[in-house]
């Protein structure tokens, strides 16, 4: 099975123990991972940040010692924005560029592949979305020939439905793509104004959504039926939780919220916080399990986090070999407790290893 | 074997203008951002400009900003630094480097402003 | 911007010494601290970046630490060849900025 771990370039600005450079990864742990994100400027890819190559140099000398890790890089994200995406896709001028500039610029700096993370392609971006792929792989092909390893080609795809059926071609781009990484999680948000789960396996009778699609077994049964192989499909499990602030005396799921949770002390985000801040959470809290959907939750005042913990990363492991996927994707490494001293276990990677451990088992 | 190989410099007038170059070798320039790092006689290092490897971004300086450009042509293997309404207090070898971390360093040239 | 403050800024000792120079920056910039040494007339060398890593090809007798705003560089055992000048540089942010040097001369 593959273990496909995202590591994010911006969790080297968090301050003390949060901030997590390459050199921190083990390089046993994942059979790929990630580097998030490159930039596309001048129809070039490019680096996000003015270190980006030092940590690249980081990242992939963890391939000395282990040379079956893969690692790839991913081009996009949030905050590269859909709208630049879609211009270069849309014109063939700019996305020949773009792919052209791709393979010397990942041969450069080590990297195995590219993982393309538009997020999301617009309804008129369908098509060109299904081009940039197709293209980018005959280019991958071409530029291989002189005897050289091909490089990989993935990409990470919305676990929702409504942008699923607007965004993607899976069965076309389903071809090109060496592996697929649905981003099973952020189902549910404060949008919502109640709590509930972002990654629940399994809807369950306590889901408070008004759809029947916001859980992981939806999103990856309609992939399915959709035309992407078994084989080429990586169920993404969160090491990070979302967070809500209740509105009541209310604690279970469906409560009132009257927003998003509050900042992690290291990754400072309302409404989101770290497997490590978690556990650090998790003192004086009440955990309370989810059991249709098989994910944990926690209160503590007028806090409410869901998550997930080694007993439901093992339930959506199972699951996946069940539907005989490809494998587990992490988000991310740095979420997870990467040194091992928040979650009381003298274990680092808690969560990313019990996934491991579980793709393993018999 | 990685070369950078800086020219360009010489003698010019308070006011006057410059164009450096450095040309490069034996790595995939294009897949990596570059700098101009400036030495004045007896000084230490002085950061001067840099430009990211498809250059949509550059830096600069606050004591050079609006005075110098630097750019570059990928096809050609080459980084620039047009340098004008030069100052006596630009004089300095300079030096062009590669990486954010300057891995490797040209040799230097030499700009003299002087009347 | 962010100050770079070197000391000390020149010292004496022998070969076989163990040397030691530090680096402090005005703010905190994590582990982006990159040490290089120059040679009179020549260009300066990349030694040691991101606080730590040891350059490919650079003697295992230098060596890189700390994070935040203090960092040190240490020379185990100085040779002939390390007489230098050696500046840090924080790559955290631009504008970038080199501290002021630290001559080492033979005692």
């Known amino acids: 099975y593959k273990l496909v771990c995202y590591y994010t370039s911006w969790s080297q600005y968090r301050e003390g123990d949060g901030s997590c450079f390459p050199d921190a990864l083990d390089r046993f742990l994942c059979t790929h991972i990630i580097y998030s994100f490159a930039n596309i400027s001048n129809d070039h890819i490019d680096t996000w940040e003015w270190n980006d190559v030092t940590l690249y140099g980081m990242l992939n000398t963890l391939k000395n010692r282990n040379p079956n890790l893969k690692t790839l890089l991913s081009v996009g994200g949030w905050n590269f924005g859909s709208q630049r995406f879609s211009k270069i896709a849309s014109n063939t001028q700019s996305r020949r560029t773009f792919i052209k500039s791709v393979p010397p610029f990942l041969r450069t700096h080590g990297f195995d592949g590219l993982d393309l993370a538009w997020l999301y392609p617009g309804r008129r971006d369908k098509q060109h979305f299904t081009t940039l792929i197709k293209e980018m792989k005959a280019e991958f092909i071409k530029e291989a020939q002189p005897g050289k390893k091909q490089l990989l080609l993935s990409a990470a795809l919305s676990a929702g439905k409504v942008t699923i059926d607007s965004s993607y071609d899976i069965a076309k781009i389903s071809q090109h793509l060496d592996f697929i990484s649905i981003m099973t999680y952020d189902f549910h948000g404060a949008w919502r104004g109640t709590t509930g789960h972002h990654s629940p396996l399994f809807r369950g009778q306590e889901d408070a959504s008004p759809d029947r699609f916001s859980n992981t077994d939806y999103a990856v049964g309609y992939m399915l039926r959709l035309g992407a192989p078994a084989s080429k499909l990586v169920m993404g499990i969160p090491t990070f939780g979302r967070s809500f602030t209740l509105a009541s005396s209310e604690t279970g799921v469906g409560a009132p919220i009257s927003g998003p949770g509050i900042p992690g002390r290291f990754t400072k985000e309302a409404g989101t916080l770290a497997y490590y801040e978690i556990c650090d959470f998790l003192r004086g809290a009440t955990v309370h399990r989810i059991l249709g959907q098989q994910v944990p939750y926690a209160t503590k005042g007028n806090q409410w986090v869901g998550y997930d913990d080694q007993e439901s990363v093992k339930s959506k492991v199972q699951y996946l070999k069940d539907r005989q996927l490809a494998g587990a994707m992490v988000w991310a490494l740095d979420l997870d407790d990467f040194q091992g001293s928040f979650c009381g276990q003298d274990l680092r990677f808690p969560l990313t290893n019990a996934i491991k451990d579980a793709l393993a088992a018999t | 074997e990685v070369q950078l190989v800086e020219s360009g410099g010489g003698l010019v007038q308070p006011g006057g203008s410059l164009r450096l170059s450095c040309a490069a070798s034996g790595f995939t320039f294009s897949s990596y951002a570059m700098s101009w790092v400036r030495q004045a006689p007896g000084k230490g290092l002085e950061w001067v400009s840099s430009i990211s490897s498809s250059s949509g971004t550059t830096h600069y300086a606050d004591s050079v900003k609006g005075r110098f450009t630097i750019s570059r042509d990928n096809s050609k293997n080459t980084l620039y630094l047009q340098m004008n309404s030069l100052r006596a207090e630009d004089t300095a070898v300079y030096y062009c480097?590669?990486?954010?971390?300057?891995?490797?360093w040209g040799q230097g040239t030499l700009v003299t402003v002087s009347s | 911007d962010i100050q770079m403050t070197q000391s000390p800024s020149s010292l004496s000792a022998s070969v076989g010494d163990r040397v030691t120079i530090t680096c402090r920056a005005s703010q905190d910039i994590s582990r982006w601290l990159n040490w290089y040494q120059q040679k009179p007339g020549k260009a300066p060398k990349l030694l040691i970046y991101a606080a730590s890593t040891l350059q490919s090809g650079v003697p295992s007798r230098f060596s890189g630490s700390g994070s935040g705003t203090d960092f040190t560089l240490t020379i185990s055992s100085l040779q002939p060849e390390d007489f230098a000048t050696y500046y840090c540089?924080?790559?955290?942010?631009?504008?970038?900025?080199f501290g002021q040097g630290t001559k080492v001369e033979i005692k």
């Open positions: 480097a590669k990486g954010g971390a300057f891995d490797y």
């Open positions: 540089q924080q790559s955290y942010s631009f504008p970038l900025t």
